[in-house]
């Protein structure tokens, strides 16, 4: 997911950085800009219940991380839900995972110093056909 | 998703910051620490094809963003795929979306100055019942 080594023409108005760790250590403004102006994420909030592979959302809190709260999906069933509302064991509910970037306080408990960290989170579940290995 | 206003006992070894923008502007080490040591994200890489709500992955590249490459899921069908491989008109494929944090170069083209940005990405697709039947 992460690719950062792109040469960019430097803007003369950039903050100066002669830090020996540059470009590893950068300045980040935590005043979040939200690009999701045209989308309402709440509209998909009931999919977890209506999916054929429904999931529950578990709160994962860590004050040493930014954001400190992340919601993790856990599939409710091993199989998928059929039209009758029963579990179909011929199909599998599986988590859809995504690697995301978070900020980890480093050194610990420091309010203004972070390190970028990659974590794997389960966002929701999908219903898949199991892989059947045919024996000759 | 984001919650940052937590009081943390300050570590005396923290870098000093008397910046007037503090705590909005922080130092971040871009040397990514990967916590996913026990997980193999490739294991879910074929779910996009085996799901009853399959999806394609589209590359979204932006050199002004960190990470510069993000993969976006687009559901292949409006309906879901049944056991025969045909569309089931009674079910819908929908994207599972997640708000993630990225770093946006600010001012533009600056290699060492960023602003935190929240964007909504589609991670995969799930199969849902279109109508919720409310029982009296």
């Amino acid at each position: 997911i992460v690719k950062a080594g792109i040469t960019i023409p430097r803007n003369p108005g950039c903050p100066n950085s002669e830090d020996k760790n540059f470009p590893r250590t950068v300045m980040v403004n935590l005043n979040i800009h939200n690009r999701n102006t045209n989308t309402n994420p709440k509209r998909s909030s009931d999919y977890y219940n209506r999916s054929t592979s429904p999931w529950n959302l578990h709160r994962n809190e860590d004050p040493e991380r930014y954001p400190s709260v992340i919601w993790e999906a856990k599939c409710r069933h091993l199989g998928c839900i059929n039209a009758d509302g029963n579990v179909d064991y011929h199909m599998n509910s599986v988590p859809i995972q995504q690697e995301i970037l978070v900020l980890r306080r480093e050194p610990p408990h420091c309010p203004n110093s972070f390190r970028l960290e990659k974590i794997l989170v389960s966002v929701g579940c999908t219903c898949v056909t199991p892989i059947v290995h045919h024996v000759a | 998703i984001v919650k940052a206003g937590i009081t943390i006992p300050r570590n005396p070894g923290c870098p000093n910051s008397e910046d007037k923008n503090f705590p909005r502007t922080v130092m971040v080490n871009l040397n990514i620490h990967n916590r996913n040591t026990n997980t193999n994200p490739k294991r879910s890489s074929d779910y996009y094809n085996r799901s009853t709500s399959p999806w394609n992955l589209h590359r979204n590249e932006d050199p002004e963003r960190y990470p510069s490459v993000i993969w976006e899921a687009k559901c292949r069908h409006l309906g879901c795929i049944n056991a025969d491989g045909n569309v089931d008109y009674h079910m819908n494929s929908v994207p599972i979306q997640q708000e993630i944090l990225v770093l946006r170069r600010e001012p533009p083209h600056c290699p060492n100055s960023f602003r935190l940005e929240k964007i909504l990405v589609s991670v995969g697709c799930t199969c849902v019942t279109p109508i919720v039947h409310h029982v009296a």
Epitope: - | L78, V87, I131
Partner: antibody
Framework: EVQLVESGGGVVQPGRSLRLSCAAS????????MSWVRQAPGKGLELVAI????????FYPDSVKGRFTISRDNSKNTLYLQMNSLRAEDTAVYYC?????????????WGQGTLVTVSS | DIQMTQSPSSLSASVGDRVTITCQAS??????LAWYQQKPGKAPKLLIS???SLETGVPSRFSGSGSGKDYTFTISSLQPEDIATYYC?????????FGGGTKVEIK
């Protein structure tokens, strides 16, 4: 140029049958979902039947279920609608329409329509 | 079935006027909405799908917006060739259903 041409309409008595055809040209017929949509005189549009690209999935609303059958012959680039047990309320212009995708959800090309009149 | 309530059923406006048509679904249709134009004696023509996506070749004066149950179709500057009946159609839940239509006339 995409073209859809319906045929087979006419006047028929209640209880009788009729078969409509839609000849497609100008696109790869076998990769598109198709539908029949009807419009009673002076009225709005009503879905009649849907079929996916390979004929493996179909759908009918309750108003025609059990009486109408949609089918396709991809080797002949033709869509069909078999209408049995016709009723006066089936009187309408019948359009065949193409979905821009495999399945038949919304319609980017329509034929000119064929009029079916059910009357004694 | 999902009911699509379109309003007004007819309207009369002058050339150059901004024209707005609304379509309300009986439940959330998650942006799965199409808009069609039908001229007298002709087949419908697709203008917009996905609530907002303009079809190729459709003039930019036509636009769609909305979410959830409520959707809007706008002609930013009415032209004489826009005289027609306009229909919305949901494709979230079968059977796909159409609004009753809005007949647009020139004053």
């Amino acid at each position: 140029e995409v073209q859809l041409v319906e045929s087979g309409g006419g006047v028929v008595q209640p209880g009788r049958s009729l078969r409509l055809s839609c000849a497609a040209s100008g696109f790869t017929f076998s990769t598109y979902g198709m539908s029949w949509v009807r419009q009673a005189p002076g009225k709005g549009l009503e879905l009649v039947a849907i079929i996916n690209h390979n004929g493996g999935s179909t759908f009918y609303p309750d108003s025609v279920k059990g009486r109408f059958t949609i089918s396709r012959d991809n080797s002949k680039n033709t869509l069909y609608l078999q209408m049995n047990s016709l009723r006066a309320e089936d009187t309408a212009v019948y359009y065949c329409a193409r979905d821009p995708r495999h399945d038949g959800y919304f319609f980017d090309y329509w034929g000119q329509g064929t009029l079916v009149t059910v009357s004694s | 079935d999902i009911q699509m309530t379109q309003s007004p059923s007819s309207l009369s406006a002058s050339v150059g006027d901004r024209v707005t048509i609304t379509c309300q679904a009986s439940e959330d249709i998650y942006d799965r909405l199409a808009w069609y134009q039908q001229k007298p004696g002709k087949a419908p023509k697709l203008l917009i799908s996905g609530a907002t996506s303009l079809e190729t070749g459709v003039p930019s004066r036509f636009s769609g917006s909305g979410s959830g149950k409520d959707y809007t179709f706008t002609i930013s500057s009415l032209q004489p060739e826009d005289i027609a009946t306009y229909y919305c159609q949901q494709y979230w839940s079968v059977p796909w259903t159409f609004g009753g239509g809005t007949k647009v006339e020139i004053k």
